[in-house]
């Protein structure tokens, strides 16, 4: 007897969609093979229609899709635009066609929906619209016109042309009489409920002359399309609820027990503090259609989710609904990073960002989450030497360590680069991290003077002090360009007296600029690193007047200006315009990202999202 | 309020046949699961066969034990769930339920999915 289980018969109509669920003994291996669903042939083969691996049969091509749950054993096969030619015995299996790891499946497509016993059937979703069409004589056209719902054996009135509304429908229900060339009559129902289901009677005259048509209301709630991500991934629910909603407010709500579902995200401003941080709810277009993108996936983020359209922003009965079910894959592949990283004001961070290692040649992105309006993420850095003006030399996108994943070091740090941060690329999608940077209390630990001048065609030596802490990392100091910072020679100048308690393992690194030239005017970083993985970062600039006086110079801790709490930069420095991003597959969907470079560094709040993934500045 | 009411149980030697019925009054939504559970004196009750119906689509679902010999449909004008048992075993000797409930992604032969059930019906069969 094979193991695999499904359902035995599957019935529907031309035009509908069939989601037939098999399932599977969730053993390792079972979970890793090929899935398939084949048709079985009059002489015993099965021709396979689709499979995990990727195949579609021109059959289903842009209609099917095969989806493999491996933590609930079931594999779901989504076959849409059914027609009466896909009538037939099937298989769901696992391995080869010819194994017997399958189960049989028939599916009977039968004509319709239309005419059942002179009855019009209409199957229309939850909180759509239907408009039930009455068709009467000439000796009826002046006569009243009336629409009644069938209640058990007694039929009630819903609407009639004498102005009359049951109180169910009311705001929602209209009659309409077309011109005086067509015997027709409309009942047009909005924001359908299920409550509305039922047959129905349209009726023109009153006496034993009059005109009466049957109609069968089916309300459906829209079966929910399964979603399957990765643990610390990303989802992106896309909503389109049709051009008659596009004024009214969006929500996206996740189901909790019975009917309750709590408003993950709207458009009237309301989030759920779970989602800080870590969602977009992205403009919708003129058609009314929207998408809410989800980051750093948690186990405790599956189950059924809802996205509609009501005024109030959130699930009312007659709102029309789109409907996901999402499983979030523990065995991920994307790695754990720390997801909250700590640096001091004045100080640095290291952010390590993961990303499809298929992906290599993809662009690198950082942006700064907004939780303004519905959440944005305005781009600050990516790997292609563009770099937010606001942020030109202390912020920093290095490819390192590479192999799946790149690095971000962001420092001069102030209160009020508190916040979350998302590291993306123009590939994958699915690859979208969050981390959030917490400023504490505490003094940066490498020293370097604040502000530098250096003298034209002079030598200038710049000291940076590093603590013992660091006697086993590399040390170097480079300078900062749009696409990285670029390495120089240094020299070690033996201990530092900079700090109080610490041994000969500290120490005094220098940078010497020799022949001082315009082209030296700029930042520089001193820093530490291990291998390919970046610690501490402090910045200097370097500014470059005309000679005043001979000789070279050597600037100390004690001459050198503090550095302030903020750098603000001064028109001197080349504002980049708002670079568009180049790779249309980068978020089509997420304008609000590539469209808001420019804006202005904003005050932000950190919100502490609990995790136990921490890192501080300094660590790997 | 739904109701169902089952009938058409009875006594019957191994190998019979018999037609269970489940009147089904007051449902009203066009997406739902409906089934045919059974319970042997002293055992746990059991999914036997289930549909799962969502607008004019349906998926019919039975357990490995009534596969082949069991077979379960339903008659919207008439509101009515049956299930036709061929090749009656011993073993089948039960008391049937109709039950309804919420639309089901996947298979419906779990009980905590239905909310609405009847009395049920007696299946006796003797050898």
């Known amino acids: 007897k094979s193991p695999i289980f499904g359902p035995e018969e599957v019935n529907s109509v031309e035009g509908n969609s069939v989601s037939i669920t098999c399932y599977y003994p969730p053993t390792s291996v079972n979970r890793h093979t090929r899935k398939y669903w084949c048709r079985q042939g009059a002489r015993g083969g099965c021709i396979t229609l689709i499979s995990s691996e990727g195949y579609v049969s021109s059959k289903y091509a842009g209609r099917a899709n095969l989806t493999n749950f491996p933590e609930n054993g079931t594999f779901v096969v989504n076959i849409a635009q059914l027609s009466q030619d896909d009538s037939g015995r099937y298989k769901c299996g696992l391995g080869i066609n010819s194994r017997g790891l399958s189960f049989d499946v028939s599916l009977e497509v039968s004509q319709g929906p239309g005419l059942l016993n002179d009855t019009k059937v209409y199957t229309v979703d939850l909180g759509r619209t239907v408009t039930i069409n009455c068709p009467f004589k000439t000796e009826n056209a002046q006569k009243r016109k009336s629409l009644y719902k069938q209640i058990g054996l007694y039929p009630v009135l819903v609407i009639d042309s004498s102005g009359y509304v049951n109180p169910n429908y009311t705001g929602r229900i209209r009659l309409d009489i077309q011109g005086t060339g067509q015997l027709l009559f409309s009942v047009v129902i909005n924001q359908l409920r299920l409550s509305d289901a039922g047959q129905y009677l349209c009726q023109a005259g009153d006496d034993s002359n009059s005109n009466k048509k049957n109609a069968d209301l089916q309300v459906l709630k829209p079966e929910p399309e399964l979603v399957y991500e990765d643990l610390r991934g990303s989802v992106t629910f896309h909503c389109a609820l049709g051009p008659e909603v596009a004024n009214v407010a969006k929500f996206l709500c996740r189901q909790s027990s019975g009917e309750n579902c709590d408003v993950v995200v709207n458009t009237l401003g309301k989030r759920a503090p779970a989602f800080e941080g870590r969602i977009l709810l992205n403009p919708q277009d003129k058609d009314g259609s929207f998408s809410v993108v989800i980051t750093g996936l948690r186990k405790e983020d599956a189950g059924r989710y809802l996205c509609g359209a009501h005024s109030d922003g959130q699930l009312q009965e007659g709102s029309p609904i789109q409907a996901w079910q999402l499983f979030v894959n523990e065995e991920s592949t994307i790695p754990r990073s720390p997801t909250v990283v700590k640096g001091v004001a004045g100080g640095s961070v290291a952010v390590l960002c993961p990303y499809n290692r298929k992906e290599s040649k993809s662009i690198k992105y950082w942006c700064l989450w907004e939780g303004a309006q519905n959440g944005r993420c305005p781009l600050l850095v990516d790997s292609e030497g563009w770099v937010k003006a606001q942020y030109e030399g202390r912020l920093s996108l290095l490819e390192e360590p590479g192999n799946g994943t790149f690095t971000v070091i962001l420092n001069q740090l102030t209160s009020r680069d508190a916040g979350f941060y998302w590291c993306l690329t123009n590939g994958d999608t699915l690859w979208r991290t969050t981390v959030e940077i917490k400023i504490i209390e505490g003094e940066p630990n490498l020293k370097v003077p604040g502000n530098v001048t250096a003298v034209l065609g002079e030598t200038l030596k710049v000291p940076c002090h590093f603590p013992c802490k660091f006697s086993s990392y590399e040390k170097y100091w480079c300078k900062w360009n749009n696409t990285g910072c670029q390495a120089l020679p240094s020299q070690d100048e033996g201990p530092s007296k900079a700090f109080v308690n610490c041994d000969e393992n500290s120490r005094l690194v220098s940078l010497t600029l020799n022949l001082v030239t315009r082209a030296d005017e700029g930042w520089y970083w001193c820093g530490v690193k291990q291998g390919h993985f970046y610690g501490e970062t402090a910045a200097v600039y370097v500014a470059v007047e005309e000679r005043k006086a001979a000789g070279s110079r050597d600037v100390s801790l004690a001459k050198a200006d503090a550095a302030p709490d903020e750098k603000v930069l001064d028109s001197g420095f080349r504002e980049i315009e708002n670079k568009a991003i180049q790779d249309p597959r980068l978020f089509a969907e997420e304008k609000a990202v590539a469209d808001t470079r420019d804006q202005a560094d904003g005050s932000r709040a950190s919100v502490d999202s609990g995790s136990s993934e921490e890192q501080g500045g300094s660590s790997r | 309020q739904v109701q169902l009411v089952e009938s058409g149980g009875g006594s019957v030697q191994a190998g019979g046949s018999l037609r269970l019925s489940c009147q089904v009054s007051?449902?009203?939504?066009?997406?739902?699961?409906m089934g045919w559970f059974r319970q042997a004196r002293g055992k746990e009750r059991e999914g036997v066969a289930c549909i799962n119906i969502n607008g004019m689509t349906s998926y019919k679902w039975y357990d490995d034990s009534v596969k082949g010999r069991f077979a379960i449909s339903q008659d919207n004008t008439k509101n009515t769930l049956y299930l036709q048992m061929n090749s009656l075993k011993p073993e089948d000797t039960a008391m049937y339920y109709c039950?309804?409930?919420?639309?089901?992604?996947?298979?419906?032969?779990?009980?905590?999915?239905?909310?609405?059930w009847g009395r049920g019906t007696q299946v006796t069969v003797s050898s």
């Open positions: 039950a309804a409930g919420r639309y089901q992604l996947g298979h419906c032969l779990a009980l905590p999915a239905y909310t609405d």
């Open positions: 007051g449902y009203t939504g066009s997406q739902h699961s």
